[in-house]
Interface confidence: medium
């Protein structure tokens, strides 16, 4: 036989049997010769257990590279693969030998000593119970207990192979405590050894690194990374770490199990990586991998090593922040720093402390921003190690969506008389200034009214006042600008040339921050008119009357009602004139009817008016033809009685003969006080030189004479008493003699 030289291809050794599978009977002798090109060795089943005494390997006499394997008195357990191979190579020839032993069809292998089968509860996993056979074509089933269950090969996932054993999906036997294989030969039943079933967990729920994300350190500091794995029970776990630096001498890894909390269905494992003194070469990605045999999970973090402490603002820092009034403002601080800096906020130079409206820290939060909050905010960062400081200023601009002044007022309930000219205004404050104010309108009957809501009027669509179709004749005047309450406001006015149609008008103001609107009810009536007598504003305890005048040809059933606080049901209707629909809910007043040639006049007299008489009074009249009720509302305001007061000082005056003296006696009081002037305690009477104006408030003395000097007293009196104030007139100069010829 030729010797194989290096470089030549190595042919597998040749066996004396040509078959891949050899079947022999028990108690006979097995002999196989192997010939090859270099040194040979044999491997046979259960090699480690049976020492060489039963198996003989001998040199052939006729060839240098030839060995014969002899096994006398073979038994079923000798069934298996017999392999002849070249030393130090993978080149081999194999024959599988079945030793047919009908008394012992199952082979017990070396590893079967323990008789343990490890399985995982995985639907896709199969397990092999190693009950190999000494006969290739046995009918084998698997018995599991307890409860007792038998599994038969199904030609699919359940099978028996004499060389491997019984294969079955692991979940099918996960309930069992033990399993064994069973074969039937000539009505005789044979069993393999018992295998204990151990369910092994494999699921890793998660792997968590602490600290997570990115870790920042300065050179020389200690790094401690904890890797915690949470698994199901019955799991064995291996950890491995990947890290940047190849120098391992300064790294220390400790793995340990963590005691699970009682009642938990998870197991915890911890691996700790420690570097006592980090260097720049330790910077990089650190990955912790946990492996359970069937499952791998990993997590990673980045360790950044700085050569020294530092501080700087990030590029994303804004210099201008705009916010809408009422919103929450957040001004984040973006910085690059190691270690984390101390952060201090200042507003217009003053430090800001956290309170219920402002929270300071990594970001400045203003809970509900107001215009007062506008200004310059400065954030100062301090590095706690190096004490280096950095500052950045942010200007906060607070935008105000349009606020319509009249919205704050309770809309007057007065109706508008047919055919009259009326002016509607919207006073708007907005910051930044308005893009525009637009006016819209819609017919009263095209809208619905729900007084309980914030905005009681709902119109499906609004029509621009430039849509001239169907409303009152309108003119929008040029916007006026006025400083009101210290704010620049825009006043937009809508002039209704003649009130013919009941409508709703809406002014809509828009700026960068949003929009505001005000809906004005413009209810036109062609009916009764309300007047107050006397025309002056009434004061308590005075006598006064409310007159409701209606055309006798058009109206009948004139009635006065008071819209009292008890009349809440008034607000339940859908109509835009809900008062008229709920007259029964109002307090009916007794009035006196007078008539003239064209009108009926219903008068409610207040002999001794009190503050309780204030409120909204409704005059109702019924259209004779249509029977429709018309209602008119008048708000009656009664002034509280007030004793007279002199509201300013009367200054002493010095003047020269022939000049004019003017003095005003500023008074207040209800009813309006009666003013009397005295000179040196004598009542002052008007003459050619002494003039009293504005209800005697203004005293003028023209071409003063020496004798006009003296003590002047102003006295203001009403039913509650009098008030007095005095002034001294000093007249200087010499009286000229008048020549009367």
């Amino acid at each position: 036989a030729s010797v194989g030289l290096p470089g030549d291809s190595l042919h597998p050794p040749k066996l004396s049997t040509q078959k891949d599978i050899l079947t022999i009977l028990a108690n006979t002798t097995l002999q196989i010769t192997c010939r090859g090109q270099r040194d040979l060795d044999w491997l046979w089943p259960n090699t480690p257990r049976d020492s060489e005494e039963r198996v003989l390997v001998t040199e052939c006499g006729d060839s240098i590279f030839c060995k014969t394997l002899t096994v006398p008195r073979v038994v079923g357990n000798d069934t298996g693969a017999y392999k002849c191979f070249y030393r130090d190579t993978d080149v081999s020839s194999i024959v599988y030998v079945y030793v047919q032993d009908h008394r012992s069809p199952f082979i017990a292998s070396v590893s079967d000593e323990h008789g343990i089968v490890y399985i995982t509860e995985n639907k896709n996993k199969t397990v092999v119970i190693p009950c190999r056979g000494s006969i290739s074509n046995l009918n084998v089933s698997l018995c599991a207990r307890y409860p007792e269950k038998r599994f038969v090969p199904d030609g699919n996932r359940i099978s028996w192979d004499s060389e491997k054993g019984f294969t079955i999906p692991s979940y099918m036997i996960s309930y069992a405590g033990m399993v064994f294989c069973e074969a039937k030969i000539n009505d005789e039943t044979y069993q393999s050894i018992m295998y204990i079933v151990l369910v092994v967990g494999y699921r890793i729920y998660d792997v968590v690194l602490s600290p997570p994300h990115e870790i920042e350190l300065s050179a020389g500091e200690k790094l401690v990374l904890n890797c915690t794995a949470r698994t199901e029970l019955n799991v064995g776990l291996d950890f491995s770490w990947q890290f940047p630096s190849s120098k391992h001498q300064h790294k220390k890894i400790v793995n340990r199990d963590v005691k699970s909390l009682p009642g938990t269905v998870a197991k915890m494992f911890l691996s700790t990586l420690t570097i006592d003194s980090v260097t720049k070469s330790d910077q990089g990605e650190y990955t912790c991998t946990a492996y359970s045999g069937l499952m791998t999970k990993k997590n990673k973090t980045f360790v950044r090593v700085h050569t020294k402490p530092f501080i700087a603002f990030g590029s994303g820092m804004k210099s201008l922040v705009e916010a809408t009034v009422g919103s929450q403002v957040r001004i984040p601080v973006k910085y690059l720093s190691y270690p984390a800096p101390d952060i201090k906020w200042y507003r217009n130079g003053r430090p800001i402390e956290s309170n219920y409206t402002m929270i300071v820290g990594d970001e400045l939060t203003i809970m509900e921003v107001s215009e007062r909050d506008a200004g310059n905010y400065t954030v100062i960062l301090t590095n706690p190690i190096s004490m280096e400081k950095q500052s950045h200023m942010v200007s906060l601009v607070v935008n105000v969506p349009p606020q319509i002044g009249e919205k704050a007022l309770i809309s007057p309930m007065d109706s508008y008389q047919y055919g009259t000219m009326q002016t509607l205004t919207c006073t708007v404050y907005a910051n930044p200034p308005l893009h525009h104010i637009q006016w819209y309108w819609q017919l009263e009957e095209a809208c619905s009214y729900r007084p309980s809501q914030t905005n009681p009027y709902t119109c499906k669509e609004w029509r621009h006042v430039k849509d001239f179709q169907g409303g009152n004749k309108i003119e929008v005047t040029k916007n006026q600008y006025a400083l009101i309450e210290g704010k620049n406001k825009t006043v937009s006015t809508l002039v209704i040339q003649a009130a013919y149609v009941s409508a709703l008008y809406k002014c809509e103001a828009i700026n960068k921050a949003g929009r505001g609107e005000r809906v004005i009810s413009f209810h036109v009536i062609r009916g009764p008119e309300i007047t107050v007598q006397p025309a002056t504003q009434p004061t308590e305890r005075e006598s006064m009357s409310l007159l409701c005048t209606a055309d006798r040809n058009t109206f009948e059933n004139l009635t006065w009602y008071k819209l009292g606080s008890q009349a809440t049901s008034v607000h339940m209707g859908e109509s835009l004139t809900p008062v008229c629909k709920n007259l029964d809910a109002l307090w009916k007043l007794n009035g006196t009817v007078f008539s003239n040639s064209t009108n009926d006049i219903l008068i409610v007299a207040f002999q001794n008016a009190s503050l309780q008489d204030q409120g909204n009074y409704v005059c109702s009249a019924q259209d004779k033809k249509t029977k429709k009720r018309h209602c008119l509302v008048k708000q009656l305001v009664i002034l509280e009685r007030m004793a007279p007061m002199i509201t300013g000082n009367l200054e002493n005056q010095t003047t020269t003969i022939g000049e004019t003296i003017e003095v005003v006696c500023p008074t207040s009081g209800n009813p309006t006080p009666l003013i009397t002037w005295f000179k040196d305690n004598e009542t002052l009477v008007e003459d050619s030189g002494i003039v009293l104006k504005d209800g005697n408030r203004n005293l003028t003395i023209r071409r003063v004479r020496k004798e006009d000097g003296g003590l002047y007293t102003c006295q203001a009196c009403n039913v509650l008493g009098c008030a007095r104030a005095e002034t001294l007139f000093i007249i200087e100069g010499v009286q000229e003699k008048t020549n009367l010829e």
């Epitope: 047919y418 017919l443 095209a446 001239f468 179709q469 169907g470 003119e475 149609v501 009941s502």
Partner: antibody, heavy 115, light 108 residues
Framework: EVQLLESGGGLVQPGGSLRLSCAAS????????MGWVRQAPGKGLEWVSS????????NYADSVKGRFTISRDNSKNTLYLQMNSLRAEDTAVYYC????????WGQGTLVTVSS | DIQMTQSPGTLSLSPGDRATLSCRAS???????LAWYQQKPGQAPRVLIY???TRATGIPDRFTGSGSGTDFTLTISRLEPEDSAVYYC?????????FGGGTKVEIK
Amino acid sequence: EVQLLESGGGLVQPGGSLRLSCAASGFTFSWYVMGWVRQAPGKGLEWVSSIYPSGGATNYADSVKGRFTISRDNSKNTLYLQMNSLRAEDTAVYYCARGNYFDYWGQGTLVTVSS
Amino acid sequence: DIQMTQSPGTLSLSPGDRATLSCRASQSVSSNYLAWYQQKPGQAPRVLIYGASTRATGIPDRFTGSGSGTDFTLTISRLEPEDSAVYYCQQFDSSPLSFGGGTKVEIK
């Protein structure tokens, strides 16, 4: 689609009466001012009368005041023109139109006053 | 009452020409309550312009309204054969409403 359809025109003797109707569709009739405009043969346009949405206010040309009455029934989406004491000079095509300026017109109905 | 006067009575122009129609009110028309109409023979009028300068829906942009107070103008920038019609102005500022006498535009 907005549509206005006049009816009621015809031949009438001087001093007689006619009632014109205008059926409206395709819009919310009760929201709009409605009017009548006439055009005598070979002449220009002449406004006759207008009525406000709820029917509460009406306006008339001096030439028809006291003789013609404009009215509307919002529930029926219909505009009317009652013409009494008709004269020869009232002969014209009468158009029903929507609005203060007239954005939609009917095709007109001819009224002839002649003995 | 407001009287409306239109000029010229007739305007004879070629296609592509610019037509300028004038309308004068006897007193000021507030807030530009003025409209322009086009009427072709045998048809009802149709509105072109309202509010003195606002084009009505579907009206080509060659029709432009301008003016305020007492003097108003309708301009047709490039005349087309279908523009041959009578054009009326109308004030709707105050009652009684009134139309101008009309301007007839002929295309040569």
